[in-house]
């Protein structure tokens, strides 16, 4: 299967971990498939929920992925780049705060450039409840990690804010920042940030980034 949409269409409609295959390759990767939300078929490319996984990782780790697909994890920039350059994908970002509120941002067009172009993110067609301005800077920026500084700031955003992300200088979001528990999650410049929903210092409780073909 190329993605969770193909898994779903084959009759596997239960949430869980499935083995996907890189486009035009035999290389495999394990991903969590959400087969319930919004019609199912979602490939989860990022999840934060409890702080159990360190997201301050190297370029290579963000390239190939890390963590546990059933819990906190990053699927891998290379797979996502290859996948989203095959056809049109949508990206949905689901967010939870510490007060029981949920919100989402949906981008109707999403792809990552190749590693040669630093996995630059491209997003269009924003809708949703997590802000009418995109908290991922538009146009998209190159991906940066602690050992791969591609942001627009002399400050090295990934080291300062922690985590790999499409930093601007440093920009209004970072879903791969430090995980802060409840009552320690405010006034945190390096937390899990989605500015146009909760502001600059609020660190979120949980985040999920998921993709699905636009024609699903």
């Amino acid at each position: 299967f190329r993605d969770c949409a193909e898994v779903f269409k084959s009759g596997h409609t239960t949430n869980g971990i499935y083995t996907l295959t890189f486009p035009n390759s035999t290389e495999e990767i394990k991903a969590y498939c959400d087969m319930e939300a919004g019609g199912g078929g979602w490939t989860i490319i990022q999840r934060r929920e409890d702080g159990s996984v360190d997201f301050q990782r190297t370029w290579k780790e963000y390239k190939v992925g890390f963590g546990n697909p059933s819990g906190e994890y990053w699927l891998g920039n290379e797979f996502v780049s290859q996948l989203t350059n095959q056809q049109r994908y949508v990206l949905k970002i689901h967010l939870k705060d510490w007060e029981g509120n949920e919100a989402y941002s949906l981008y109707e067009h999403f792809y990552l450039s190749s590693e040669e172009l630093n996995y630059r993110i491209h997003l269009k067609g924003l809708t949703g409840t997590a802000g009418k301005i995109s908290s991922i800077s538009q146009p998209g920026n190159d991906f940066s990690t602690k050992d791969g500084d591609n942001d627009k700031c002399i400050c090295k955003c990934s080291q300062m804010l922690t985590g790999g992300w499409w930093f601007d200088a440093c920009g209004p979001s970072n879903l791969n920042g430090m995980y802060y528990p409840q009552r320690q999650n405010t006034a945190k410049f390096n937390g899990i940030k989605w500015y146009y929903w909760k502001g600059s210092g609020y660190s979120l409780k949980a985040t999920t980034m998921m993709i699905r073909p636009a024609d699903f």
Epitope: N85, Y111, E116, R120, K124, L126, I133, S134
Partner: antibody, heavy 121, light 107 residues
Framework: DVQLQESGPGLVKPSQSLSLTCTVT?????????WNWIRQFPGNKLEWMGY???????SYNPSLKSRISITRDTSKNQFFLQLNSVTPEDTATYYC??????????????WGQGTSVTVSS | SIVMTQTPKLLLVSAGDRVTITCKAS??????VAWYQQKPGQSPKLLIY???NRYTGVPDRFTGSGYGTDFTFAISTVQAEDLAIYFC?????????FGGGTKLEIK
């Protein structure tokens, strides 16, 4: 710096084909983004005609779909416009431009200087 | 196709004035709206994209705002070199479409 330059005949006869070339320097058209043709009619109205993406896929304005073809020569870093069965209503200044997005229509950040095409017998 | 209705068609202003141009989309264009400046004899130049993001090197007197169907472009303090035609463009749905243009003339 990215630069785009249109070239082609300034005069085309009705019912013939219009062929234009856009030569890109400073960026590989196979790396990223979409590469567009836009025209501006007398009176300044702008019309998007179509694009060829870095991956080679194309998208056309439905109003032109039966007449238009956009192709490329990656070895020369050029892309081309062919518009068939032209009429005097196709008289315009033709621009090539780069989109800020690679898989869909988008705003355009780099434009050529434009080439004027008159359709007349 | 989404129709972009741009108003006004002509703006006659003095240097130092603040000017506002509006574009109304016939259906939602999300935040996928750009604004261009075209000076006489030149090609269009991108000023604003994603409704409110200033393109690289564009002076901060140029601003954009809006979401959905209503979009606004403003020049806070008009300068003589701002003499041009200004166009809005939606690229939320294909084909992308342009407004009819606003000609800015300096008194």
């Amino acid at each position: 710096d990215v630069q785009l330059q249109e070239s082609g005949p300034g005069l085309v006869k009705p019912s013939q084909s219009l062929s234009l070339t856009c030569t890109v320097t400073g960026y590989s058209i196979t790396s990223d983004y979409a590469w567009n043709w836009i025209r501006q009619f007398p009176g300044n109205k702008l019309e998007w005609m179509g694009y060829i993406s870095y991956s080679g896929s194309t998208s056309y304005n439905p109003s032109l779909k039966s007449r238009i073809s956009i192709t490329r020569d990656t070895s020369k870093n050029q892309f081309f416009l062919q518009l068939n069965s032209v009429t005097p209503e196709d008289t315009a200044t033709y621009y090539c431009a780069r989109s800020t997005f690679g898989h869909y229509v988008s705003s355009m950040d780099y434009w050529g200087q434009g080439t004027s095409v008159t359709v007349s017998s | 196709s989404i129709v972009m209705t741009q108003t006004p068609k002509l703006l006659l202003v003095s240097a130092g004035d603040r000017v506002t141009i509006t574009c109304k989309a016939s259906q939602s264009a999300s935040n996928d709206v750009a604004w261009y400046q075209q000076k006489p004899g030149q090609s269009p130049k991108l000023l604003i994209y994603y409704a409110s993001n200033r393109y690289t090197g564009v002076p901060d007197r140029f601003t954009g705002s809006g979401y959905g169907t209503d979009f606004t472009f403003a020049i806070s303090t008009v300068q003589a070199e701002d003499l041009a035609i200004y166009f809005c463009q939606q690229d939320y749905s294909s084909p992308p479409t342009f407004g009819g243009g606003t000609k800015l003339e300096i008194k």
